[in-house]
Structure formats: C-alpha cells, structure tokens
C-alpha cells in the first residue's frame, strides 16, 4: 500500500512550496499533489500520449534552463529535494508547473542521472485547465524500490521546442549492506600468508566489516569497508566469510574455501594402447591435482624378468596429453610400468604398477657363413648358410628371405625367395648366363625381417665353362666379400 508523507493539503490552484529539508521515512514516501480539495483532473495522459487541449497558435521565444525567456517566465514549482526510503518500499514523487493557455503542445519527460526514462515506467501527467493557465502535474511512481533506483530525477518540459528543467529530486534507497567485492576462493601454500578482500556499501553508510573463519569471528573490532584480511598462513583448509553491518542490519558474504596446496594423488587407470617390439603406448587418468596445476609427469619402467636385474628407466613427459610412448624397449619382454605427476608442491606417488609386454622383434643379426657355388650340370646356384645366433627377444625363426640380384650388360634384376626355418641351404635357378649373381640372406620371425648378410657374388659364365669353386661371405674383418670364379 502506498502511504502519503506530505504537507498540509492546499486546494488547487495553489501548489505546494518546498518541503523543509528532506523527507525520511521507513514507510513509502509519497509526494504528490493532494486531491482532497474536490478538484478533479480534467484530462489525464500517459507519457506516450503527451498533449493538452488546443488553445490557439502563439509564437514562443527561446527558453534556456537557466531561466525562462517566455513571457510570463515559466518554471517548475519547488518540491521535495531528497527522499530517503528503505529497499522494497513504494515511492511516488511529482513536479508541477502552471502554463499559460497561450502555449500549446507541451510535453513533460522524466530524466534520471542525465538519461531519459522511457518505456514501462509509472509516469502519469495530469492537466488541470483554467481560464488563463493550465496546471500540469507529472507524477512518477516506483514500486518496490531497489538500489538501482538511487539517483537524481528531474522533469523536463518542452514548449514549442524550448526546454524548462525542474530542480532535481534525489532518491536515496537505503538497505542492508550490499557487497561490491566478496572474498574469493583460493588455493594457497601451507603456512604462507595471503590476503582476502571484502567491500560493501550502503546507503546508509558507514558499513563495518567483521571477518569470520570457520564460523568464528576473526576481528573483535569492526573495520570500515573496504577491509583486507591478512591471514598469516594455514595448515589446513578453512572457510572464510565477511559480515557487513550498517544501521539497517547485517549481510553475510558467501563462504569461500581456502584450500591448502598439496602433492597430487597418483594417476589411476594406466592403460596399454599399443605395443610393438620396441615401444609401448600408454595412457593414464590424472589423480587429484592437489589444488595446483600439474606441471609434468614421469613414467617409470622396469623389465620384469626373474633372471635379470633389469635397470629402471625413467621417462619425463608433459602432464598433458595423458599419454606417452615408451621407446627403446627390448622385444618380447615384460615390463612393469607406473606413472607419477608433479605440481608446484611436489611429485605424486607412482600409480599402481601395470604389466605390459612388447611383441616379437625382427632378428638383429644375419645368417652366418653364406657360401654360393654354381652347379652347372643342373643349371642352378647352390646357397648354404648357418642359422644366426638370434636373441630370444627376436621371437621364433619362421624362415629366411634370399635376395639374388642378376647383373649383365647393364641390366639388373632382383628376385626374392622365401624358405622355411629348417633349411640351411637353397638352390636357385640360373636366370642369366654370362652375368654376376649377388646373394644376400636374412632371417625372418613373426616380428619381421632381420638384416641381410653381406652380399656374396658369383659369376655365371656362358654355357660350357664349368667352375665349382664356391663364393662365400668374408671372414670377420674383411672389408669386401670374396669373389671366387
């Protein structure tokens, strides 16, 4: 309900003069022209339909806000200058002016802090015509005022493009303190000082601040807003808030958690994505970061072999992505793998170990003692070799790959043969006479093809020229393979 706070009612056409000082009420302040005299407004217009009855067409001199050059001079009547009220109350205030009927097409607009108030505001203009003058009362009402309604309100009247401005009406909405800056959650280093800030405003001022830590007041005497609390350091998580007090009461800020930075939790769910003979691709889920961003991670790897005192390998990597390809591993081996990550405080523990295996590798050595000789009667080349001394990591031998290249008169042709793992000799048909045949052999496992032996060359003469002398791989230390013809 709107209640009025006003001076003694005076019948129209007399208008209220200035109120003494300002009006302060915990009820709604309503300043309006009383209608107790029995006069009723003749016309009512909304702000979007300005105007009044036409009374003639008269030229008007220019008007400034400093003073009207209109004859007679026109000015808004004085009204209350300052209204103080509590938040959520209703308020109504007005400005009034008497305009000679010689003027027409007058409009009144409301302005707040220099900006015109347009749209859905509760502004009503009432016209009270008489023989010589028309009394105009512009009322502005606000229901359930908020702090944002604080400000300086004025009326402006345009008469034939000239402007008359009223004295300002200052609206001051008072309420509980309003926070303009609240403490923020923080992650801090153990036993290290940090600051929290709290700022609240009225009106009414002053606003006093009390700090609260874990439900207990920190300062016995209040501090004027704004307040900075310096906490010398914490050893465990705490919740801080601030209380802002003014004459209207108290407002409590949000509670903010101050976390103590700690080492991270170990990563979890270390997974194998791909294994090759010499590498393993892993991923992990980071643990809790200890309220401090991860900086980097470390992958620890150890070969799991009951017979070996396998050395520990440590690979450092970035914290993101949570993935790493471990390289330089032995083929066909088992590894225990763990991951730890660090933040600014320190390293996490290593994740629980996972077991991972590399696949079979290709042989690392070539077959030994390769010898080649020509069997002219059968028109083929005999090749013999010794099984390579492959490591178990190379996996099971599945066979051999024989490369033989035939070169004659500028023409070169390479052929490949595959033979089973039980063989240590092979025969290949002579492809070209009067040519050089170059033979190389590689061992093959499921992991791939190993290195080829050093080339062994044999000359294949034209038909009828027999030579049974073999060619063979060189003895260790020889620079070039021996060619025996």
């Amino acid at each position: 309900a709107i209640t009025e706070a006003r001076e003694e009612a005076k019948p129209y056409p007399l208008f209220p003069g200035p109120l003494p000082g300002s009006l302060q009420t915990d009820h709604t302040s309503l300043l309006s022209l009383p209608h107790t005299s029995g006069y009723q407004p003749a016309l009512m217009f909304s702000p979007t339909q300005p105007g009044r009855p036409y009374t003639g067409n008269v030229a008007i001199p220019r008007v400034t806000s400093a003073g009207s050059k209109l004859l007679p001079p026109l000015a808004f009547k004085h009204t209350v200058g300052h209204i103080i009220l509590s938040e959520h109350k209703d308020v109504k205030f007005n400005c009034s002016i008497s305009v000679p009927n010689i003027y027409q097409d007058t409009t009144i607009s409301w302005w707040k802090d220099g900006k015109e108030l347009l749209g859905a505001h509760h502004a009503i203009t009432q016209f009270y015509p008489d023989d010589e003058v028309t009394a105009i009362i512009a009322s502005f009402s606000i229901t359930s005022v908020q702090r944002s309604d604080n400000g300086s309100y004025i009326c402006k009247m345009k008469i034939n493009n000239e402007e008359i401005v009223s004295d300002p009406i200052y609206i001051e909405v008072q309420g509980l303190p309003h926070f303009t800056k609240q403490p923020e959650s923080m992650n801090v280093t153990r036993n290290t000082a940090f600051n929290l800030t709290c700022q609240a405003v009225g009106p009414p001022e002053p606003v006093n601040i009390f700090w609260v830590q874990n439900s207990s007041r920190v300062n016995e005497q209040p501090e004027k807003s704004p307040s900075v609390l310096t906490v010398p350091g914490l050893t465990e998580m705490a919740v801080f808030s601030c209380e802002a007090h003014n004459d209207k009461g108290l407002t409590v800020s949000k509670g903010v958690q101050i976390n103590i930075k700690a080492i991270p939790s170990p990563p979890t769910e270390v997974s194998i994505h791909n294994s090759t003979a010499h590498s393993i691709l892993i991923s992990w889920v980071p643990g809790f970061d200890g309220y401090s961003p991860f900086r980097n991670c470390s992958v620890q790897v150890k070969e799991v072999d009951p017979l070996s005192n396998g050395s520990v390998m440590i690979f450092n990597t970035s914290a993101s992505p949570h993935m790493y390809q471990i390289k330089q591993l032995q083929a066909l081996a088992n590894y225990s793998i763990g991951v730890s990550c660090m933040n600014e405080i320190g390293w996490s523990a290593v994740s629980p170990w996972i077991l991972a295996s590399t696949t079979e590798g290709a042989p690392s050595v070539a077959p030994l003692n390769v010898t080649v000789f020509l069997n002219e009667s059968r028109d083929n080349v005999d090749i013999r070799w010794m099984k390579p001394l492959t490591k178990r990591q190379a996996g099971e031998l599945v066979g051999y790959r024989i490369s033989h290249v035939w070169q004659s008169a500028g023409i070169s042709k390479e052929l490949l043969e595959e033979v089973g793992q039980n063989n240590s000799r092979a025969q290949i048909s002579v492809q070209v006479h009067n040519a050089t045949c170059t033979v190389r052999i590689a061992a093959v496992t499921k992991g791939g093809v190993g290195p080829f032996s050093d080339p062994v060359k044999i000359f294949i003469p034209a038909h009828g020229w027999v030579d049974h002398a073999p060619s063979s791989t060189p003895a260790p230390g020889n620079a070039d393979p021996v060619l025996i013809i």
């Epitope: 620890q300 150890k302 225990s336 660090m342 523990a349 290593v350 629980p352 170990w353 996972i354 077991l355």
Partner: antibody
Framework: EVQLQQSGPELVKPGASVKISCKTS????????MHWVKQSHGKSLEWIGG????????IYNQKFKGKATLTVDKSSSTAYMELRSLTSEDSEVYYC??????????WGQGTTLKVSS | DIVMTQSHKFMSTSVGDRVSITCKAS??????VAWYQQKPGHSPKLLIY???TRRTGVPDRFTGSGSGTDFTLTISNVQSEDLADYFC?????????FGAGTKLELK
C-alpha cells in the same frame, strides 16, 4: 646383495613419538619406492604408505595419515618412518619393504615397537 | 579399499602332498597379485608376482594362477620347509592390501 637394515626395538611412553630407520645397500636407492608395513599380532599385514626416494612422492594409507610420516635421506640411502601420538595399539612390528615394481621384493628384518608407561 | 580374503586361516598337509591356498579380491585386480611366505621370527619373502611369475630362486613346486578376483598359490610336493604363513597381496590400486594369511601346518 640387496639389504634393508632396520633400527632396533623401541620402548616408548604413550603420547611420545618414535623414528624408525631403514638403511639400504646393494642397489640404487633412488630407483625403488620404499614401503612401510605394520604386522599386527604376528599375523596380518597392513600397508602404511610408500615414498619414492627419487622425487619424494609419498602416498599414505588414509588410516595412517597423521600417525606416520615418511622421509628419506638420499645421501645415506636411508628411509625413515616417524610414528607420533603413540598408544598401546601401535605396539607391533614394523617393516620397511622395497617395491620391486611388482610387489615387495626385499624386506627389512622388522622393528618391534612397544608402547608402555 | 580392496579386501583380500584368504578363507582358510589354517591348512593341514603332509610332506609330498599338493596344497592350494586361495585368495579372493573384493573387486577386479587384474593380475596385480603377489604371494609371500613368512616363517616364524622372519620377514615375509616374495614368492610369486604378477599372479604367476615365480621369483628367481623360488622352487618350481610353487605356482600361482588366477586373474580378476580369484587367485591360487599351489605347492606341489610340499616340503617341511614350506610350513609357514602365506599372504596374498594386491597392488592394483591404493591402498595396497594383504590377505589375513593362511598358516600351512602338518597334519
């Protein structure tokens, strides 16, 4: 040969603290995590926590957080466990054990702690 | 926490027998299980890791098997020096946990 040599038996008063040591030899101290285990009633084993001497990453069994503090001295290749606010329930045998990357492959000989007034 | 349950606190056997000690995990631990032997007055000694890998120097009469939640330590041809407490241990997730132990004794 890998060896973990623990400090001798301790007799302490309730409320006091004790620091047990585990001196290692025969391997690179920083390459292996050191764990501590409590054995109650000569039977069940309880993991207390582990420390990585390489980067000082530590993890505790929640049950022993606040009770045990693990540290290392790299220069002497020694791991330590401090137990505080001791009560009669802490009167047990405590082992240090090296993490072989797949279980605890070497154990200290154990330190017997007796808390009594 | 993962609970490792060794259902038999005691198991009676004779020299030359075959005995199986079981351990059940309260949730899947993959193959991250180790077995320890402890004799009176001594520290535990690692026998088996990764469920089935025998540690160097451990006699081949000790074998480990299982995966997921059910694990077994089998001693074939039990010898008198095998009479001891046996503990299973999971290292799949923190906190690391042990079984309550099974005491192997002579009939």
């Amino acid at each position: 040969e890998v060896q973990l040599q623990q400090s001798g038996p301790e007799l302490v008063k309730p409320g006091a603290s004790v620091k047990i040591s585990c001196k290692t030899s025969g391997y690179t101290f920083t390459e292996y995590i050191m764990h501590w285990v409590k054995q109650s009633h000569g039977k069940s084993l309880e993991w207390i926590g582990g420390i990585n001497p390489n980067n000082l990453g530590i993890i505790y069994n929640q049950k022993f957080k606040g009770k045990a503090t693990l540290t290392v001295d790299k220069s002497s290749s020694t791991a330590y466990m401090e137990l505080r606010s001791l009560t009669s329930e802490d009167s047990e045998v405590y082992y240090c054990a090296r993490d072989g990357y797949f279980g605890f492959d070497y154990w200290g000989q154990g330190t017997t702690l007796k808390v009594s007034s | 926490d993962i609970v490792m349950t060794q259902s038999h606190k005691f198991m009676s056997t004779s020299v030359g027998d075959r005995v199986s000690i079981t351990c059940k995990a309260s949730q899947d631990v993959g193959t991250s299980v180790a077995w320890y032997q402890q004799k009176p007055g001594h520290s535990p000694k690692l026998l088996i890791y990764w469920t089935s890998t025998r540690r160097t120097g451990v006699p081949d009469r000790f074998t480990g098997s299982g995966s997921g939640t059910d694990f077994t330590l089998t001693i074939s041809n039990v010898q008198s020096e095998d009479l001891a407490d046996y503990f299973c241990h999971q290292y799949n997730s923190y906190p690391l946990t042990f079984g309550a132990g099974t005491k192997l004794e002579l009939k």
